[in-house]
């Protein structure tokens, strides 16, 4: 499936739209809000009852090249005594983001948008208990 | 994808940087993954730091619908099902890339935009400052 065209009645395609070859779209990868400030709480990955580690994946043919993935440290959750409680579960929280993939075909290069699923952190959940009949 | 011929000195002219503007195929790889977090899991209800999901819709953006998490409580849910204010529910935030129609309303012209979304919540121990 493709990106939906803006064909709704409240949209009129402006005259100023750049010409684009069929089956493709023009993408400016100069990022809007590139330098926005993130005001996240400190060290939540180690203070969480479902702590996680970060791994950086690097791919020079992807934009952005660097994608950070989280992995839950434990199967269970950390209790008030600092011990793992396996009656609770640490589970990953995931979010989709877009990347641009560069593909080489001989002496030509093409670009493809790709959805990537990023694990951003973990949360502690009560397990779903299935009772045997 | 749309192929762009490389420089005549092709084998030696590998450009490590991406060009500022690229033509990309309209088809998105991995497009049909589930984008509604309510359908993909019920962690938002089962978590000790549960959250509500709010729909953020913008037709000038792709994806046009993004779900934002808001923690339900200041504290976390304890074993008795009560809110414990000695622990804190905090949002897990992530910067993601989306497409912004540029110029506005144009069907096939976009610019990448970085936005900050709250994806879910996690329960943390507060930072305690000990008086010296």
């Amino acid at each position: 499936r493709k990106i939906p065209k803006v064909g709704h009645t409240f949209f009129q395609k402006p005259e100023s739209c750049p010409p684009v070859p069929g089956g493709s779209m023009k993408l400016d990868i100069g990022i809007i809000n590139e330098n926005q400030r993130v005001s996240m709480s400190r060290n939540i990955e180690s203070r969480s009852t479902s702590p996680w580690n970060y791994t950086v994946t690097w791919d020079p043919n992807r934009y952005p090249s660097e994608v950070v993935q989280a992995q839950c440290r434990n199967l269970g959750c950390i209790n008030a005594q600092g011990k793992e409680d396996i009656s609770m579960n640490s589970v990953p929280i995931q979010q989709e983001t877009l990347v641009v993939r560069r593909k080489h075909q001989g002496c030509s290069v093409s670009f493809q948008l790709e959805k990537v699923l990023v694990t951003v952190g973990c949360t502690c959940v009560t397990p779903v208990i299935h009772h045997v009949q | 994808g749309i192929t762009i011929p490389r420089n005549p000195g092709c084998p030696n002219s590998e450009d490590k940087n991406f060009p500022r503007t690229v033509m990309v195929n309209l088809n998105i790889h991995n497009r049909n993954t589930n984008t509604n977090p309510k359908r993909s899991s019920d962690y938002y209800n089962r978590s000790t730091s549960p959250w509500n999901l709010h729909r953020n819709e913008d037709p000038e953006r792709y994806p046009s619908v993004i779900w934002e998490a808001k923690c339900r409580h200041l504290g976390c849910i304890n074993a008795d099902g009560n809110v414990d204010y000695h622990m804190n529910s905090v949002p897990i935030q992530q910067e993601i890339l989306v497409l912004r129609r540029e110029p506005p309303h144009c069907p096939n012209s976009f610019r990448l935009e970085k936005i900050l979304v709250s994806v879910g919540c996690t329960c943390v121990t507060p930072i305690v400052h000990h008086v010296a």
């Epitope: 709480s41 939540i44 | 804190n88 905090v90 949002p91 507060p126 930072i127 305690v128």
Partner: nanobody
């Protein structure tokens, strides 16, 4: 905290919170209230190094937060009080929150001051 008490609807109160220097090292200071039988909710907060303020929709235009960094004191001016403002008001300091998000990740709680508004 101090400044709580009983007041008629439409009246005013001014709460103050003299917090430790440790609380002021956190990103935000604010007021969290808990009405009888309800949960705690962040109603107003301010950046400890100046900057953005947050007001819950229910108190916008009626409550004003201010701080005196020299005295490590924060104030909450509450005007046009309503019976639904009746609650225990806690002074709080935390790491999270901004102009659109109530204070969260709280590391410092005051002991609370009761505000009762009668109709």
């Amino acid at each position: 905290e101090s400044g709580g008490g009983s007041v008629q609807a439409g009246g005013s109160l001014r709460l103050s919170c003299a917090a430790s220097e440790y609380a002021w090292r956190l990103n935000r200071m604010g007021w969290v209230r808990q009405a009888p039988g309800k949960e705690r909710e962040g109603v107003v907060s301010i950046g400890t190094r100046g900057g953005s303020t947050y007001y819950a929709d229910s108190v916008k235009g009626r409550f004003t937060i201010a701080q005196d960094n020299a005295k490590n004191t924060m104030y909450l001016q509450m005007n046009s009080l309503k019976p639904e403002d009746t609650a225990m008001y806690y002074c709080a300091a935390g790491l999270g929150g901004d102009s659109r998000t109530p204070i969260y990740d709280i590391s410092y709680w005051g002991q609370g001051t009761q505000v009762t508004v009668s109709s």
